[in-house]
């Protein structure tokens, strides 16, 4: 632990002014694991002037950083790049004349205290004023800056020409696109100072490339994957003062796939479990030994979990007997195609026979054993049939 500091497994605090520290505290190699440090408290360190790019990076678990009544003048732009857990920063009563929002833009800070610093009135600190105005909490800080006449002005009153928030405008076509197709988004940004523009595509799976000039940009997404349905794409304009973004949600249409269909399991009811993916929402059709299975209060489709374009459910059977043994086929279809899977179900042996499958079971099955198509958003029981409302246009569909 550095001189003038005390260290525990999760905290470092340096408050002794003598002899004091001249650099940000670093732990010796074989001491406490820096990843476990969650709080660093520094006070009364007049000779601590700089936080360098690599000073804080080892403290990846850091949540609270306090440097008060010290000599901090400069913070490197990427000083907190690796400290994504940072929530509270307190730089009260230091020697900061400027501070860029770039230090903090990637952090989800709940508190940034900057009281008592000799900020210079310029566009560089306008973001702090904007941040203050955005906070509706009553405990806003009394921040000041020195103008050209070396006069202290409340930051709340600061007016600087040609220094405002940028704007982003995303000109997106209808962002409903078929799997495998491509799409181009265009975005324009404006502002003074002139903003930079970038795309935030999150964890987009599909291949994408962007062309960006200062105020115009395009994003081309090719061979769009069904996994990207529901994802948000944002165009971001950023300058010294702050950022603006315009976002669209991507909807990908694709043919259904039955990713899971298994033999029945018994719980409160018997259940033939399935998982279906598709967009628009597929209609489900069940067949029993090749014949339409019209749903009833005794046999019906239940969807238990819907995860955007994925549906987990059951063909639920109430008290099935040997008469229900046989082949169950599930067909899922929408206008982009259809998928089909089949399982054999054995619920019960024949009466008077040890619980073994009877190879003759199809002989005694009556046709059209009570599901018609079931829109998988509808899980209510209905007598005899469940109408399908989801297959809107499948011209050109083959299976």
């Amino acid at each position: 632990c550095p001189t003038s500091c005390k260290c525990s497994a999760s905290r470092i605090w340096c408050s002794d002014p003598s002899p004091g520290i001249v650099a940000f505290p670093r732990l010796e190699p074989n001491s406490v694991d820096p990843e476990n440090i969650t709080e660093i408290f520094i006070a009364n360190q007049k000779r601590l002037e700089i936080i360098n790019e690599d000073d804080v990076e080892a403290y990846v678990g850091l949540r609270n950083l306090t440097i008060v009544d010290s000599g901090l003048k400069f913070v490197a732009h990427k000083a907190f790049l690796k400290n994504s857990n940072l929530q509270h920063i307190n730089f009260t009563r230091n020697k900061l004349t400027s501070l860029s929002r770039k230090h903090f833009r990637h952090l989800d800070l709940s508190e940034l205290i900057l009281v008592g610093n000799p900020f210079t009135c310029s566009c560089d600190i306008m973001w702090i004023k904007t941040l203050q105005e955005a906070k509706s909490s009553p405990d806003t800080q009394d921040l000041y800056c020195l103008n050209e006449s070396s006069k202290n002005i409340p930051l709340a009153n600061l007016q600087i020409p040609n220094c405002g928030l940028p704007s982003a405008n995303l000109a997106a076509p209808n962002l409903t696109v078929e799997e495998g197709k491509s799409i181009t988004l265009s975005c324009s940004v404006a502002g003074d100072p002139v903003p930079n523009m970038y795309w935030d595509v999150g964890n987009l799976v599909s291949k994408h490339m962007n062309e960006t000039s200062h105020t115009q940009g395009s994003l081309r997404i090719t061979n769009i994957s069904s996994d990207d349905s529901g994802k948000q794409i944002s165009c971001v304009a950023e300058n010294l003062v702050g950022e603006d973004q315009d976002s669209v949600n991507l909807t990908v249409h694709f043919a259904p796939t039955i990713t899971f269909l298994e033999s029945p399991t018994s719980d409160h009811h018997w259940c033939i479990p399935f998982t279906v993916k598709g967009n628009p929402k597929p209609a489900l059709q069940w067949f029993y030994n090749g014949a339409i299975l019209n749903e009833s209060k005794y046999i019906c489709t239940k969807i238990h979990v819907t995860n955007h374009t994925e549906y987990h459910g059951c063909l639920q059977l109430d008290n099935p007997t040997h008469m229900n043994n046989g082949d169950y086929t599930l067909i899922a279809k929408n206008e982009y195609g259809k998928d089909e899977k089949q399982i054999s179900a054995h619920f019960m042996g024949w009466p008077g026979i040890d619980d073994g499958a009877n190879p003759n079971y199809p002989d005694v099955i009556y046709e059209d054993y009570g599901t018609a198509a079931n829109d998988i958003g509808d899980t209510t029981n209905r007598s005899n049939e469940i109408p399908s409302t989801d297959v809107t246009d499948k011209t050109g569909r083959e299976h």
């Epitope: 209609a283 059709q285 067949f287 090749g290 014949a291 339409i292 019209n294 067909i331 206008e335 998928d339 089909e340 899977k341 089949q342 059209d368 018609a372 198509a373 049939e385 469940i386 109408p387 399908s388 409302t389 297959v391 809107t392 246009d393 499948k394 011209t395 050109g396 569909r397 083959e398 299976h399």
Partner: antibody
């Protein structure tokens, strides 16, 4: 009980059109494709195409493209197949069949005779 | 279009004896979804066809278990384990994998 009931026999002159109907019952009509198949006297079966009764979307066999029209009236759960510019070799029994890639259900057939 | 070729074209069978019908397609009937849509139909004089077997080997609801289907890819077989009098008729194989759907020539008649 699934049933497909077709309209009665027709006699038409060459160049005329014929419209055969197929009324479905016992299942949700709009949920399943309806196919049309024909069988010339003493011959085999020939697939003509299908209609999706929900959307009205159709797909016709190349041979009948431009000459066949498949439609439906969902309010009465009925599918129609109209064949235009009839020729003598269109004389056949026309069947509606459904409801998926195996033809589990068939209408009783409609005999269309084309003769001058 | 896929051509479906059936053999033999005629099959005299003694009641109670087995019978076998072969069907060959001009290309594979395995669909990209993993299913093979090869179906067998029976037609009796003056009646519409009736589905016996769907997707190679699945017996349709109500079809007696003396009917069975087998095969894969391009070669398929319908077997009747013990022919009964009511089995007399024309048998068609049919593919529903690729449009246009096509049928075997169906000349085969059990006498």
């Amino acid at each position: 009980q699934v049933q497909l009931v077709q309209s009665g026999a027709e006699v038409k002159k060459p160049g005329a059109s014929v419209k055969v109907s197929c009324k479905a019952s016992g299942y949700t009509f709009t949920a399943y494709d309806m196919h049309w198949v024909r069988q010339a006297p003493g011959q085999g079966l020939e697939w003509m195409g299908w209609i999706d009764p929900n959307s009205g979307g159709t797909r016709y066999a190349q041979k009948f493209q431009g000459r066949v029209t498949m439609t439906r009236d969902t309010s009465i759960s009925t599918a129609y197949m109209e064949l235009h510019r009839l020729r003598s070799d269109d004389t056949a029994v026309y069947y509606c069949a459904g409801v998926t890639s195996w033809f589990a259900y068939w209408g009783q057939g409609t005999l269309v005779t084309v003769s001058s | 279009d896929i051509v479906m070729t059936q053999s033999p074209l005629s099959l005299p069978v003694t009641l109670g004896q087995p019978a076998s019908i072969s069907c060959r397609s001009s290309q594979s009937l395995l669909h990209s979804n993993g299913n093979t849509y090869l179906n067998w139909l029976q037609q009796k004089p003056g009646q519409p066809p009736r589905l016996l077997i769907y997707k190679i080997s699945n017996r349709f609801s109500g079809v007696p278990d003396r009917f069975s289907g087998s095969g894969a890819g391009t070669d398929f077989t319908l077997k009747i384990s013990r022919v009964e009098a009511e089995d007399v008729g024309v048998y068609y194989c049919m593919q529903g994998t690729h449009e246009p759907y096509t049928f075997g020539q169906g000349k085969l008649e059990i006498k």
